[in-house]
């Protein structure tokens, strides 16, 4: 015979072909193998021109043989070289699907690998691919697109072998909160690491506002709006500055009243206030909390403490804001310019988590009074806020 | 209208007890802390007790620190003072009053009082 | 415990006169001060809350100024039923303690 050829190789297959001898013969004797595998002969009729060569190992070397028989004649003998196909990793399956991240898995193929290459593509034509070591049989995916319908394959390679790509499709499922209007509602939404989140206020998505999710104390969910912990910001400043809010929301900074008004307008929120000087922590938690509009010089409530570190706040209940440059106080003088702070102050305080960073003074100072007193300026203070009902909220999410 | 009654004073023996009573009215008793104050017949006042809108928090003066108990049920607006191992300085007119907002504040209501005598 | 002294203990003066009475404290109390009335046979009357707020109520010639440790109420035109003992009283800590009281009497 002449003109031996392979057709269609795959990963476990081959068709092999070639021209018939001129003269007639009795049969064919075709042999492959491959390094690592064994010889296999096969005998064929003499009038047949091609053979399915079966039972192939994936991604290797193969040299097939092929001579004609006639009575005891033999042939010379012809040889091809072809190399299967490099067989592809199985079962790829996406499982723990959330909103945002999804583990894949997949069983390697027979050949060994150097590699795989993970592509997976969203319904509006995103495309990510990764390429991930040849020991790799599982994948996170992160920051997906919730309610959205996503096509995952898989490719496994060899050098500059490529196998056939398999594939898988799931779809995330939907935020619980497409819009969260606070923490809590991010946090329910599965995101569980402190830091800045972007919130709607009223869930309107033209009302954004980045915020800081405090999402480990006391289970979580929520906003900061004021913190304290190295002097670095002033806060002795005017009513402009404290309405609108300042200061760099991963440090010290105030949310600014005009944001908590819209915020605790939303619905019944609670306050925590967490204290922390010289290794030593307080905390004082309001079951009711709201900071009224700017007609009402953002009126302050305050109800239902609990805690450690004092029910210091009742005392400033029901007052308006005051600021060096807007005195509501119910003070001769002006409470904001004797203590170098805001606060929605009386006469004065007991309560001035934004007075003067570091200052011992009397009264001037980060003080708690139930907690430090007067002559001692906290090193770390943050107020924060959450819905009233977050543990019912909570509680319906992990039934969910 | 806001309404303060104390009731439970009378003449005592030292070494005994004596408990008082403070009927509240007019106003969210459970929003508010309330105290006890004291006045000696014919000398000034003199803070006793007092305890937070909850009843979770309670303060005393140095002297009835260990004998005088206060307490309050919010249900039916009341406030208390047991009174042990009375001693004849306790001899005074007991006022109950209400703390205008938070828990040491000005009293801006006070009841009529009733009186202890401590005497053998 | 913080000390309250109030000054004089005692004074005599007619209607219509202006009468002043001083407090202070032992120690710096901010704004933490109110001042009481008290007639004979009758429980106090709160009258001025953290050191210059009106009670709702009571009249217009009762003032009330000061801050820190020093304090005044002032009487601007004496009256008849102004006749009685006035007490100050510090709510900055406990235990709350009041002054020894000032009485005005008819001169």
């Known amino acids: 015979p002449s003109g031996l050829v392979t057709a269609n190789i795959t990963d476990s297959e081959a068709l092999a072909r070639w021209q018939p001898a001129i003269a007639t013969v009795d049969s064919y004797v075709i042999s492959y193998t491959g390094e690592k595998v064994p010889e296999i002969t096969r005998t064929v009729s003499g009038n047949t021109v091609e053979y399915a060569l079966t039972d192939l190992e994936p991604a290797t070397e193969y040299t097939l043989r092929i001579f004609a028989e006639k009575g005891p004649q033999k042939s010379s003998t012809i040889t091809a070289k072809f190399t299967t196909d490099l067989d592809s990793p199985r079962d790829l399956t996406a499982t723990e699907v959330q909103s945002e991240t999804a583990l894949l898995t997949w069983r390697p193929p027979r050949a060994s690998v150097t590699g795989y290459l993970l592509v997976y593509e969203s319904v509006d034509g995103t495309v990510k691919e990764v390429i991930v070591g040849p020991d790799t049989t599982s994948y996170s995916l992160a920051d997906l697109s919730p309610s959205t319908h996503y096509t995952a394959k898989i490719q496994a390679l060899n050098g500059p072998l490529r196998s056939n790509m398999i594939q898988t499709i799931f779809t995330t499922i939907g935020l619980l909160y497409p819009f969260p209007k606070d923490c809590s509602q991010a946090m329910l939404n599965g995101d569980t690491t402190s830091g800045l989140y972007t919130i709607y206020l009223n869930g309107d998505k033209a009302e954004a506002l980045e915020v800081f999710c405090d999402m480990t104390s006391d289970g979580g969910g929520w906003i900061v709006f004021l913190r304290r912990k190295n002097g670095r910001e002033n806060f002795y400043q005017n009513w402009k500055a404290y309405a609108a809010g300042f200061g760099d929301r991963r440090e010290e900074f105030w949310l600014g009243l005009d944001n908590l008004n819209k915020i605790t307008a939303q619905g019944q929120y609670e306050l925590r206030v967490d204290l922390r000087d010289h290794g030593e922590t307080a905390f004082a938690v309001y079951d009711k909390f709201s900071v009224g509009d700017a007609k009402t010089r953002y009126k302050l409530k305050v109800e239902g403490y609990s805690g450690t570190a004092g029910d210091s706040m009742a005392y400033h209940n029901g007052r308006s804001f005051s600021t060096f440059d807007k005195d509501t106080d119910s003070a001769i003088t002006n409470c904001a310019l004797s203590y170098k702070g805001a606060f929605w102050y009386r006469n004065c305080h007991r309560v001035n988590l934004m007075g003067r960073y570091g200052d011992n003074n009397h009264s001037q100072g980060v003080n708690w009074f139930h907690w430090k007193g007067h002559e001692h300026s906290i090193q770390f203070a943050e107020m924060k806020l959450r819905p009233s009902n977050f543990r019912n909220l909570e509680g319906r999410r992990k039934r969910a | 209208q806001v309404q303060l009654v104390e009731s439970g004073g009378g003449l005592v023996q030292p070494g005994r007890s004596l408990r008082l009573s403070c009927a509240a009215s007019?106003?969210?008793?459970?929003?508010?802390?309330m105290h006890w104050v004291r006045q000696a017949p014919g000398k000034g006042l003199e803070w006793v007790s007092g305890?937070?809108?909850?009843?979770?928090?309670?303060y005393y003066a140095d002297s009835v620190k260990g004998r005088f108990t206060i307490s309050r049920d919010n249900a039916k607006n009341s406030l208390y003072l047991q009174m042990n191992s009375l001693r004849a300085e306790d001899t005074a007119l007991y006022y109950c009053?209400?703390?205008?907002?938070?828990?040491?504040?000005?009293?801006?209501?006070w009841g009529q009082g009733t009186m202890v005598t401590v005497s053998s | 415990d913080i000390q309250m002294t109030q000054s004089p203990s005692s004074l005599s003066a007619s209607v219509g006169d202006r009468v002043t009475i001083t407090c202070r404290a032992s120690?710096?109390?901010?704004?933490?001060l109110n001042w009481y009335q008290q007639k004979p046979g009758k429980a106090p009357k709160l009258l001025i809350y953290?050191?210059?707020n009106l009670e709702t109520g009571v009249p217009s010639r009762f003032s009330g100024s000061g801050s820190g440790t020093d304090f005044t109420l002032t009487i601007s035109s004496l009256q008849p039923e102004d006749f009685a003992t006035y007490y100050c009283?510090?709510?900055?800590?406990?235990?709350?303690?009041f002054g020894q009281g000032t009485k005005v009497d008819i001169k």
């Open positions: 009053a209400k703390s205008y907002q938070s828990d040491e504040d000005a009293f801006d209501i």
């Open positions: 007019g106003f969210t008793f459970d929003d508010y802390a």
């Open positions: 305890i937070s809108g909850s009843g979770g928090s309670t």
């Open positions: 120690q710096y109390i901010q704004g933490f």
């Open positions: 953290d050191a210059s």
């Open positions: 009283q510090q709510s900055y800590s406990t235990p709350q303690t």
